[in-house]
């Protein structure tokens, strides 16, 4: 028995070949012997029932001369899954058609971090098929009647070529995924005390109409609990602020990409934020983490100090040095100082290896007097 795979809604071609490789009489039947169609010697396709009953069934007349008499079934339905019989040259050939339906749950437009379950349904009790989906960038996911893709990323968007294999027979279908998310999962901003701070939250997709609501929660390093800094609505890609905290007085852009401005970086603002965006008609939320590190260099009496606040990595080095000279002090700590600094332009550096994350300069005029 030959096996043919077909996807619901599409077409399937069931083979039937003559050993003579020439036109001959043939008949296609259901397993209960009802006639579907055939050719009885005059080269004319004869249908077995009313046109409306058999309008989805056809054959390839152009292939008959070569001894090929396929049964074409269009707009496949689940109930087409059965055995079909081709009668020719005093022999019968059985062809098993397995029609499957593909469902995507929760759908093919998802939020970053969500999971997709692809299910093959069929009303014929076949053994487990192999389902394999390959992204154009090379990523491969496989399963059987159920295929799962978890923790989806923006880069998983686009076309996937999927293959269903059963008894060495293959059928392919495509799916286009749209994974909505921010371009970056997290970002870090380094600022000197008093500088203006800009936070940007670019989305990694473009949609004509984008509607939802969002909020930025902030956990300051110095605070015991987090605080909602701003809430906003997004309607047709226009951003409107609903509520904003009085301290700090944030400004928010009214257009995408989402953009926030903090008038000045202060030690009490240093910390981590979590921007959440809930999109209309989507379950779940998009998240982007943002971090603020603030640096301050001061001289009080005989002590020159450099401090940083905020989420710094343990491998970051804080240094104090007189310009164009070797570092006087360099530590993997959040504060460094020099007693009785000599006059000149001092630099405080926050660095990761040889990469300077930020620096602040302070002019020491004479021992005990400074100017930033």
């Amino acid at each position: 028995k030959t096996l043919v795979l077909g996807k619901e809604g599409e077409s399937a071609e069931l083979p039937c070949e003559s050993s003579q490789k020439k036109i001959t009489v043939f008949t296609w039947k259901f397993s209960d012997q009802r006639k579907i169609l055939g050719q009885h010697g005059k080269g004319v396709l004869i249908r077995g029932g009313s046109p409306s009953q058999f309008d989805r069934f056809d054959s390839k007349k152009g292939a008959w001369e070569k001894g090929s008499f396929p049964l074409i079934i269009n707009k496949l339905k689940m109930e087409d899954s059965q055995t079909y019989i081709c009668e020719l040259e005093n022999r019968k050939e059985e062809v098993e058609l397995w029609v499957f339906k593909v469902t995507f749950s929760p759908g093919t437009s998802l939020l970053q971090g969500q999971s997709l379950t692809l299910t093959l349904d069929s009303n014929s009790k076949v053994s487990n098929p192999l389902t394999e989906c390959k992204h154009k960038k090379g990523k491969v996911v496989s399963g059987s009647k159920v295929l799962s893709m978890s923790n989806l990323r923006v880069q998983d968007s686009d076309f996937w070529n999927c293959t269903v294999t059963l008894d060495q027979k293959k059928n392919w279908f495509g799916m286009t995924l749209s994974v909505l998310g921010f371009q970056k999962a997290s970002s870090i901003v380094y600022k000197k005390e008093g500088e203006q701070v800009e936070f940007s939250f670019p989305l990694a997709f473009t949609v004509e109409k984008l509607t939802g609501s969002g909020e930025l929660w902030w956990q300051a390093e110095r605070a015991s609990s987090s605080k909602s800094w701003i809430t906003f609505d997004l309607k047709n890609k226009e951003v409107s602020v609903k509520r904003v905290t009085q301290d700090p007085k944030l400004q928010m852009g009214k257009k995408l990409p989402l953009h926030l401005t903090l008038p000045q970086a202060l030690p009490q603002y240093a910390g981590s934020g979590n921007l959440t965006l809930a999109l209309e008609a989507k379950t779940g939320k998009l998240h982007q983490e943002v971090n603020l590190v603030v640096m301050r260099a001061t001289q009080l009496q005989k002590n020159l100090t450099c401090e940083v606040w905020g989420p710094t990595s343990p491998k970051l080095m804080l240094s104090l040095k007189l310009e164009n000279k070797e570092a006087k002090v360099s530590k993997r700590e959040k504060a460094v100082w020099v007693l009785n600094p000599e006059a000149g332009m001092w630099q405080c550096l926050l660095s990761d290896g040889d990469k300077v994350k930020m620096d602040s300069r302070i002019q020491v005029l004479s021992r005990g007097v400074n100017q930033t």
């Epitope: 203006q196 047709n236 226009e238 602020v241 928010m252 009214k254 257009k255 953009h259 401005t261």
Partner: antibody, heavy 118, light 107 residues
Framework: EVQLLESGGGLVQPGGSLRLSCAAS????????MSWVRQAPGKGLEWVST????????YYADSVKGRFTISRDNSKNTLYLQMNSLRAEDTAVYYC???????????WGKGTTVTVSS | AIQMTQSPSSLSASVGDRVTITCRAS??????LGWCQQKPGKAPKFLIY???TLQSGVPSRFSGSGYGTDFTLTISSLQPEDFATYYC?????????FGQGTKVEIK
């Protein structure tokens, strides 16, 4: 051709009211944000108010908040500005503007003059 | 509110001159800035949006640049019809604010 035509300006006493209208044509009115901008005699431009597209979010300059109301009738392709408790400093030419897809005021009407004087 | 400061407030130039007008925002506004032109007794005409995108129908001698707080409008070769007052407008958020204007006069 996109056109905006303001009307309703005139002379009014302090404390009085006026309703400005702006008839729009040549574009799908309901899908664009619309604004009012004014210009006092011999002065620069001052944004007054904006109403977003069919959602209807409204925004006002502090100088007119609580006194002016912007509204739109998408079925009539018309933008309105209801001005109450008028003051001498509201004297200006009032321009109706259409926002483009990027929310910039890309088309301006010819303006209607409002004079607040006793 | 975001303040927009335009400079100079006026300038005299001749036909064919290269003219540059600057606009500074009191805080970062990305590239959410537009420029418009107004002739005496006429309604303003929109020239440039998103700091550098030319409105359709605007001659290519007009160009805009800038990001954050500092922006420039340049007229590469001044034409007789360009003598007018030019305004910048921040469109970062509400309230929308204009610069005080730069009057370009004939020398």
């Amino acid at each position: 051709e996109v056109q905006l035509l303001e009307s309703g300006g005139g002379l009014v006493q302090p404390g009085g009211s006026l309703r400005l209208s702006c008839a729009a044509s040549g574009f799908t009115f309901s899908t664009y944000a619309m604004s009012w901008v004014r210009q006092a005699p011999g002065k620069g431009l001052e944004w007054v108010s904006t109403i977003s597209d069919n959602i209807g979010n409204t925004y006002y300059a502090d100088s007119v908040k609580g006194r002016f109301t912007i509204s739109r009738d998408n079925s009539k392709n018309t933008l309105y500005l209801q001005m109450n408790s008028l003051r001498a400093e509201d004297t200006a030419v009032y321009y109706c503007t259409k926002d483009n897809e990027d929310y910039y005021m890309d088309v301006w009407g010819k303006g209607t003059t409002v004079t607040v004087s006793s | 509110a975001i303040q927009m400061t335009q400079s100079p407030s006026s300038l005299s130039a001749s036909v064919g001159d290269r003219v540059t007008i600057t606009c500074r925002a009191s805080q970062g506004i990305r590239n959410d800035l537009g420029w418009c032109q107004q002739k005496p007794g006429k309604a303003p005409k929109f020239l440039i949006y998103a700091a550098s995108t030319l409105q359709s129908g605007v001659p290519s001698r007009f160009s805009g640049s800038g990001y954050g707080t500092d922006f420039t409008l340049t007229i590469s070769s001044l034409q007789p019809e360009d003598f007018a007052t030019y305004y910048c407008l921040q469109d970062y958020n509400y309230p929308r604010t204009f610069g005080q204007g730069t009057k370009v006069e004939i020398k």
